[in-house]
Interface confidence: low
């Protein structure tokens, strides 16, 4: 019996087609992805093949103005229109709190939403009961397939699930649910979830009875053969893991942002064992036309976005200096504003010992692309912020050793004075440079804000200590020459859309007046 699994993950609000790098579509003839194009391909496959499942492995939420405005209603509407068969909860589905998941998505979705390792307690338990499930048995042709869900247990540090949801260890939580499916005579089981490729492989290895793992969170691109675009494969598609009980378990992920549709064909024997698996992600490029009815629907929903982008989010009573003359040479107040917003967005008081789990932010000055003039009545709009942060990136959480941070700050000024983008703006960090010293030895003082303290204060950076830092995904991926971050990071979790972080902060503060306050000094 043959099953076709179509899968997406980490779509992050890319409902419209995007450019090749998943930013705003500039030249339509070269754009990719989007739900209208995805629907064309899915329908084509549904027409051609008998047993098809369309699955999503989480993180539909967060990433563009679509989510900012529609807050998840757009996800439910268009996933319903595409007739998804199941979805796993990702960490970003909790970005607007549990209410922001229940009302727009859980109550509106016409497909099961899954996670076996999230347990509700207290008053929430009855409120959320039945709205998401640990597993679901789906009829496919003449057979049944069990789908069991999972979500990153780091979600409390990455999003806003509140105090009434407990995120258990994935493997511990999955095993009893799979065992239950076996007792129900379900012998074809897919683990669908959002914990990253390393955990996907562990699940394939450790959870008895799981036949296929469809994952997300790490934006992993797998491909067999010559890759069709810029993404470099982390391994073959599917990635085969040998389980502890000797089975070959295919593991798949489909990069992110709706650029690809994962396409996996599995052949099962009559006892539900996987005999063979093969496939590849399908690049959703402009050779695949956008479905006209979905596209028309997108255009209808778009109108509200255009109105939103010119509305006032808040006010500034000072000039927000985002000029390259400032932000690439010295501390600039636009850099301070953005870093303060990044930290504010990551306030998670999850431990009495820590006032927060992260206190530091770094931001490449070259990523700040425009100032905002306070003389326009002080008004700040989404449109203004899109000029400051035009690349559609995310502000991510990483763990780094102090020694890596020191290297990053040396890199920040290694060719100072040429107006290059790697000059770092900061939050929760005090740095002093001596430019008379040779490159690689210019950081003379680097103090960082403590987290394990009731009164935050600045202490000297310790080379061997592991620190959490918020930074743009561009830096986490080694951009602007920060190869040491990419090579030495100990953990990397994708965060919220950059503009969304800053806009939320400005809306929350109402009036802002960031200053240049001595975070970066030259001796």
């Amino acid at each position: 019996w043959e099953l076709t699994i179509l899968h997406t993950n980490d779509v992050h609000s890319r409902l419209e087609q995007t450019s090749e790098d998943s930013s705003k579509c500039v030249n339509a003839s070269r754009c990719m992805g989007g739900v209208a194009r995805l629907f064309t391909k899915v329908q084509q496959i549904r027409r051609a093949e008998p047993n098809v499942l369309l699955l999503d492995a989480g993180d539909q939420y967060q990433g563009t103005i679509w989510f900012t405005v529609y807050k998840g209603a757009e996800v439910a509407h268009f996933m319903n229109a595409l007739r998804y068969d199941a979805m796993a909860l990702g960490n970003h589905e909790f970005d607007n709190g549990v209410e922001g998941l229940i009302e727009p998505l859980l109550k509106e979705a016409k497909f099961p939403i899954l996670s076996a390792n999230i347990k509700a307690k207290g008053p929430l338990a009855s409120q959320i009961s039945g709205l998401y499930l640990p597993y679901k048995v789906l009829p496919v042709g003449d057979e049944v397939v069990g789908i069991v869900g999972y979500t990153s247990k780091e979600t409390p540090f990455l999003s806003n699930p509140g105090t009434n949801l407990v995120f258990e260890d994935e493997i511990t939580a999955l095993q009893p649910e799979v065992d239950k499916l076996k007792t129900l005579n379900v012998n074809k089981i897919i683990a669908l979830g959002h914990s990253g490729f390393e955990m996907d492989k562990l699940i394939a290895q450790k959870v008895r009875g799981v036949d296929v793992v469809v994952g997300g969170h790490s934006n992993t691109f797998l491909y067999t053969g010559n890759p069709p675009s810029k993404e470099v494969p982390a391994g073959k598609y599917p990635f085969i893991v040998t389980s502890d009980d000797g089975r070959k378990v295919p593991v798949v992920q489909a990069y992110a942002f709706g650029k690809y549709l994962g396409y996996l064909k599995i052949e099962f024997d009559e006892r539900g064992n996987v005999i063979s698996s093969h496939g590849n992600p399908i690049l959703l490029n402009s050779s695949i036309p956008e479905d006209p009815s979905i596209k028309a629907d997108i255009n209808k929903w778009r109108i509200k976005l255009d109105n939103y982008s010119t509305q006032e989010l808040g006010k500034t009573i000072v000039y927000l200096d985002g000029s390259s003359q400032s932000c690439r040479f010295r501390e600039c107040n636009m850099g301070n504003l953005i870093c303060d917003a990044m930290i504010n967005n990551n306030l998670r008081h999850t431990d009495e010992m820590f006032w927060n789990h992260v206190s530091m932010c770094i931001l490449n000055g070259g990523g700040i692309r425009s100032p905002i003039d306070e003389r326009n009545n002080g008004t700040i709009t989404w449109e203004n912020l899109a000029a400051v942060l035009p690349f559609g990136g995310t502000f991510d959480l990483v763990q780094l050793k102090g020694s890596t941070l020191k290297k990053a700050f040396e890199h920040s000024v290694h060719r100072y004075g040429q107006s290059t983008g790697e000059f770092l703006q900061v939050g929760g960090i005090h740095v002093v440079y001596d430019l008379s010293r040779k490159p690689g030895d210019r950081v003379v003082k680097l103090d960082v804000l403590c987290t394990k303290c009731r009164v935050p204060s600045y202490d000297p950076l310790k080379m061997d200590e592991v620190y959490k830092v918020i930074l743009p995904n561009f830096l986490a991926n080694g951009g602007d020459g920060f190869q040491m971050i990419k090579d030495e990071l100990l953990r990397h979790d994708s965060g919220d859309q950059d503009i969304n972080v800053v806009s939320t902060y400005i809306s929350k503060m109402k009036v802002i007046y960031p200053a240049v306050e001595g975070r970066i000094k030259f001796s």
């Epitope: 003359q325 400032s326 425009s370 000029a387 035009p390 107006s419 290059t420 983008g421 951009g479």
Partner: antibody, heavy 118, light 107 residues
Framework: QVQMKQSGPELVKPGASVKIPCKAS????????MDWVKQSHGESLEWIGD????????IYNQKFKGKVTLTIDKSSSTAYMELRSLTSEDTAVYYC???????????WGQGTSVTVSS | DIQMTQSPSSMYASLGERVTITCKAS??????LSWFQQKPGKSPKTLIY???RLIDGVPSRFSGSGSGQDYSLTISSLEYEDMGIYYC?????????FGGGTKLELK
């Protein structure tokens, strides 16, 4: 539509100065930086510098420091480039070019020819 | 300053031919590269920025690619109006620097 309008050709004597205007239209003047580029006859292009119309901030190519001053007049949406102490080496066509959100030049003026001759 | 080495410096091609011009930077320029076309007596016209993003209104036969230090401009099927001089420009680091140009003529 976006346009940069430059003035006509200039014939100037050695040692004199010249101020070339570049009038922008079709977009919000303060939203984009303005770059200036030199092209000597039959040669490639040379980047002179860049001005931010929001705050008048400038970045110059070291090679043109002391030779060139970039200014703006927000009220007329005009950028200016002044060339001082002119010599025959300064004979060239000078272009202004708007930069887009990526700081890449996208729209160019038609160029102003400056000839330095006694 | 970053050196931009463009090649070839001149070339002849036939109508309908696929043409590729390359530009090599003396260091990584993070895809901050533009391509321009200039015709005699005219100002340059921007074709591509950010290495591969087409400016609105530029025909789709023009495409850009590359990363790091190596970049190229391709014309998929040459037309008569494509004759002229092509320049690359890096805008990653000040001072911005142009390539020496490639003169494209009809064979």
């Amino acid at each position: 539509q976006v346009q940069m309008k430059q003035s006509g050709p200039e014939l100037v004597k050695p040692g004199a100065s010249v101020k070339i205007p570049c009038k922008a239209s079709g977009y919000t003047f303060t939203d984009s930086n303005m770059d200036w580029v030199k092209q000597s006859h039959g040669e490639s292009l040379e980047w002179i510098g860049d001005i931010n119309p929001n705050n008048g901030g400038t970045i110059y190519n070291q090679k043109f420091k002391g030779k060139v001053t970039l200014t703006i007049d927000k009220s007329s949406s005009t950028a200016y480039m002044e060339l001082r102490s002119l010599t025959s080496e300064d004979t060239a066509v000078y272009y202004c070019a708007r930069t887009n959100w990526d700081y890449a030049m996208d729209y160019w003026g038609q160029g102003t020819s400056v000839t330095v001759s006694s | 300053d970053i050196q931009m080495t463009q090649s070839p410096s001149s070339m002849y091609a036939s109508l309908g031919e696929r043409v590729t011009i390359t530009c090599k930077a003396s260091q990584d320029i993070n895809s901050n590269l533009s391509w321009f076309q200039q015709k005699p007596g005219k100002s340059p016209k921007t074709l591509i920025y950010r290495a591969n993003r087409l400016i609105d209104g530029v025909p789709s036969r023009f495409s850009g690619s590359g990363s790091g230090q190596d970049y190229s401009l391709t014309i998929s099927s040459l037309e008569y109006e494509d004759m002229g001089i092509y320049y690359c420009l890096q805008y990653d680091v000040f001072p911005r620097t142009f390539g020496g140009g490639t003169k494209l003529e009809l064979k």
